[in-house]
């Protein structure tokens, strides 16, 4: 079987515009090295929204203007986007490469619907 | 034509195109034959992949300076002989390849 | 494995040609399209996506191991090679190709 990225199906934004979701994969091989990506699908594009390398046992980084921050535990990768707007919901797909050793891998996972819901302003008090 | 045994560098400038946000690749044609894909290297270079047929031999490599890509080609034999052809992977997937150049026929032959 | 080798087929025929996996990777499977003297030109990538630009006559299919493309009606600038080729893991094997040829 191919490698096997699995995500949830539909994740609602906090209030705040906070997303967390787990992305997990089964790996084919003993991979020290793993690159993990988040795609936004929306009207047919996809577009980049961060990624980070990790190397097995170590924490998951993210450049320090990105709008995502990880956690990762063996072949689990905790998720966290932040700064969202209720136009930024669309479908977020998680993509993992396995980069090293050789032979590279690639895990592309089917997509969680992120629904972002703009709160409302708070009524002005006469 | 290059004498097997011998070295040879192959360059391909890239255009028309972010060259430094890409994954780039090496296919070759024998004469007569289907493709066989040869490495890639990416965006910044920093993994490369080889098939078995030339690991060890060739190293490919790029230049994100002069948006060119290069490859190495050492210990050439007859059955390399083909037309290579440089490609563009595409970001969301890198062994996608979705704009390739002409091609440049390589000869080994004594 | 790719099938058949070679086909003969006259314009407005539908064609299907057939890339066998050895495991589940047709979302990790591209189809291209190559004339005589010329580059090769991607037709379907991730199984089923239509490259832009290209005629929607083309279309890929499949799940699991058994991955295909079909052309609903084919024109007379469809009689090429064609070839499938896997993105899932290095090296990025390409099928041996079929030829497509007027009848």
């Known amino acids: 079987k191919a490698m096997h990225v699995a995500q949830p199906a539909v994740v609602l934004a906090s209030s705040r515009g906070i997303a967390s979701f787990v992305c997990e994969y089964a790996s084919p091989g003993k991979a020290t090295e793993v690159r993990v990506t988040v795609l936004r699908q929306a009207d047919s594009q996809v577009t980049e929204v961060c990624a980070a390398t990790y190397m097995m046992g170590n924490e998951l980084t993210f450049l320090d203007d990105s709008i995502c921050t990880g956690t990762s535990s063996g072949n689990q990768v905790n998720l966290t986007i932040q700064g969202l707007r209720a136009m930024d919901t669309g479908l977020y797909i998680c993509k993992v490469e396995l980069m090293y050793p050789p032979p590279y891998y690639l895990g592309i996972g089917n997509g969680t619907q992120i629904y972002v819901i703009d709160p409302e302003p708070c009524p002005d008090s006469d | 034509v290059v004498q097997p045994g011998r070295s040879l560098r192959l360059s391909c400038a890239a255009s028309?195109?972010?060259?430094?946000?890409?994954?780039m690749h090496w296919v070759r044609q024998a004469p007569g034959k289907g493709l066989e894909w040869v490495a890639v290297i990416w965006s910044d270079g920093s993994h490369k992949y080889y098939a078995d047929s030339v690991k060890g031999r060739f190293t490919i490599s790029r230049d994100n300076s002069k948006n060119t890509l290069y490859l190495q080609m050492n210990s050439l034999r007859a059955e390399d002989t083909a037309v290579y052809y440089c490609?563009?992977?595409?970001?969301?997937?890198?062994?996608?390849?979705?704009?390739w150049g002409q091609g440049t026929l390589v000869t080994v032959s004594s | 494995t790719q099938s058949p080798s070679s086909l003969s087929a006259s314009v407005g025929d539908r064609v299907t040609i057939t890339c066998r996996a050895s495991q589940s990777i047709c979302n990790y499977l591209n189809w291209y399209q190559q004339k005589p003297g010329k580059a090769p030109r991607v037709l379907i990538y991730a199984a089923s996506s239509l490259q832009g630009g290209v005629p929607s006559r083309f279309s890929g299919s499949g799940s699991g191991i058994d991955c295909t493309l079909t052309i609903s009606s084919l024109q007379p600038e469809d009689f090429a090679t064609y070839y499938c080729q896997q993105s899932y893991i290095t090296p990025f094997t390409f099928g041996p190709g079929t030829r497509v040829d007027i009848e």
């Open positions: 028309g195109f972010t060259f430094s946000s890409c994954g």
């Open positions: 490609a563009r992977g595409t970001m969301i997937v890198v062994g996608t390849l979705d704009y």
